[in-house]
């Protein structure tokens, strides 16, 4: 913490301007009034403060607003945002997308994924839901940031907004997030024709259940392996060799190069070797001929 001293009369600060860059840390602490700083935050980013000086300014704002900064201050943080921790940001209430845009721009090129994720979370909470304008802002200024939201937050996305989400925005989404988004996407695209529907739903398929994947296999979609490998393991395991062949079409050859990777490996282990051989890919590891498969999990459930 910066030590307290009294401000020399000639150093008294009446406005936030460039003369402050010549102030030592202790002089800034003693001479800058926190309320004045908050009122003139829009000037701070234009002044080339050192990181040490920014630490002092942050300390002053923290003292003035122990419960979290108001949005009028947050909007003008500029490079001071780089000094914020996720704990600081968690105290904020942000509703303006202009504020979000301004801070996303500042964070670009800096290692601030935790801070940005917390900021986006606060915006969604502040606005009450993940509406189209918020999604548009995220896709424009922070591709991939949508996936920083928790499944709980993503559940507030109305299906009507799903169309604004691009494949690259889902690139870092995990299974739990896709589990939430997939049913919304299915609803949003339900009136589209087969091929158009597949193009739209494809980025969300990591959340699809087996029955939907089986249904796709009847529609000549020729799913590529990049999409197939993103399907839930639980959705892939019940598929028959014939269904996978129909689902992948000409891409079925790609199973060979992925045969050691999940979910392909796990799927191979559940197929009869005879059936795998019909693909002519040399896939190995299926259940040998003449073996009886007992599903013990079913027996346990019955007993």
């Amino acid at each position: 913490d910066v030590e307290r001293t009294t401000c020399p009369p000639e150093k008294e600060v009446h406005e936030i301007d460039e003369s402050l860059i010549f102030y030592k840390k202790r002089e800034l602490e003693a001479c800058v009034d926190a309320a004045l700083l908050a009122a003139q935050m829009d000037r701070v980013d234009a002044i080339p403060f050192t990181y040490e000086q920014l630490d002092v300014l942050k300390h002053k704002l923290d003292e003035l607003y122990p419960q979290g900064y108001p949005e009028s201050v947050i909007r003008h943080l500029g490079h001071l945002f780089l000094k914020m921790s996720p704990e600081d940001i968690r105290k904020w209430n942000v509703t303006s997308l202009e504020t979000l845009k301004a801070l996303l721009k500042v964070s670009k090129g800096h290692e601030m994924s935790a801070q940005v994720a917390t900021l986006i979370d606060r915006v969604v909470v502040g606005r009450g839901q993940l509406d189209k304008d918020t999604v548009d802002t995220l896709t424009a200024f922070c591709p991939g940031c949508l996936c920083s939201l928790s499944p709980e937050r993503l559940s507030s996305v109305p299906p009507s907004v799903i169309g604004a989400v691009r494949p690259q925005d889902l690139d870092t989404c995990g299974p739990r997030q896709l589990d939430v988004l997939y049913p919304k996407a299915r609803l949003a695209f339900q009136n589209m024709s087969g091929s158009e529907y597949f193009v739209k739903i494809r980025p969300f398929l990591g959340g699809a259940p087996t029955e939907d994947v089986k249904a796709l296999s009847q529609q000549n979609v020729s799913m590529d392996l990049a999409t197939f490998m993103k399907l839930r393991r639980e959705a892939v395991l019940p598929l028959t060799v014939a269904e996978v062949q129909k689902l992948l079409g000409p891409h079925v050859e790609g199973l060979k190069v992925e045969e050691q990777h999940s979910p392909v490996r796990d799927w191979i282990l559940k197929q009869r070797q005879d059936d795998l051989d019909t693909l002519g890919l040399g896939l190995q590891g299926g259940i040998p001929n003449g073996y009886l498969i007992l599903d013990l999990s079913v027996r346990e459930a019955l007993s």
Epitope: P167, A226, K230, E253, G254, G282
Partner: antibody, heavy 119, light 108 residues
């Protein structure tokens, strides 16, 4: 423009470990496996293993089991290879390369990281 | 594992000369799974030929590839100075993926 960016040369002591990053840009990270290849003193190439960014599941050439650990961080589109218990035999250039899921061959390579193990 | 043996290890060719590099596999491969890479000193390898006979993007038409089973080749119909490099064959027919020892092609 597809890019796989690797870190600069590393000089490490025998017995130590090293972690080499490979940052991807210009393509959908989760549509490609990241493979790692070793090249000793300008000679032939040896496949170390590959990692799938969707599952973080890695497959290794048995020769490198226990020597190399392959991981990914999808949030930063970066793959990592950690090499441990280093000896002079590990002195080589290490390349990362991308391979589209379901396809063979490596259509884009990193510039290589030169690792020198010496006391 | 599948061992790939390339020959010759080093060769020199004059501009305009036809050059043939061979790659032998210790067990039969599906031709789709045989690739070739070009590497110049101080650079990364570049995908050159895929699935035995398909030229990668930007590869001059004087290059060609052929083969099946255990025997594969890369041919330069008319050697040019920029073709001086090392060429590696590579299989992904079975784990672990393997590379040949390489052929270094020099210009006379």
């Amino acid at each position: 423009d597809v890019q796989l960016q690797q870190s600069g040369p590393e000089l490490v002591e025998p017995g130590a470990s090293v972690r080499i990053p490979c940052k991807a840009a210009g393509h959908t990270f989760t549509d490609y496996n990241v493979d790692w290849v070793k090249q000793s003193h300008g000679q032939s190439l040896e496949w170390i293993g590959d990692v799938n960014p969707n599952t973080d599941g890695a497959i290794y050439n048995q020769k490198f089991e226990g020597k190399a650990t392959l991981t990914v961080d999808t949030s930063s589109s970066t793959a990592y290879m950690e090499l441990r218990s280093l000896t002079s035999e590990d002195t080589a250039v290490y390349f990362c390369a991308r391979r589209r899921l379901g396809q063979g061959g490596f259509d884009s390579w990193g510039q290589g990281t030169t690792l020198t193990v010496s006391s | 594992q599948v061992v790939l043996t390339q020959s010759p290890a080093i060769m020199s060719a004059s501009p305009g000369e036809k050059v043939t590099l061979t790659c032998g596999a210790s067990s039969s491969l599906i031709s789709k799974y045989l690739y070739w890479y070009q590497q110049k000193p101080g650079s990364s390898p570049k995908l050159w030929i895929y699935s035995t006979s398909n030229l990668a993007s930007g590869v001059p038409a004087r290059f060609s590839g052929s083969g099946s089973g255990t025997s594969y080749s890369l041919t330069i119909s008319s050697m040019e100075a920029e073709d001086a490099a090392s060429y590696f064959c590579h299989q992904w027919s079975s784990y672990p993926y393997t590379f040949g020892g390489g052929t270094k092609v020099e210009i006379k």
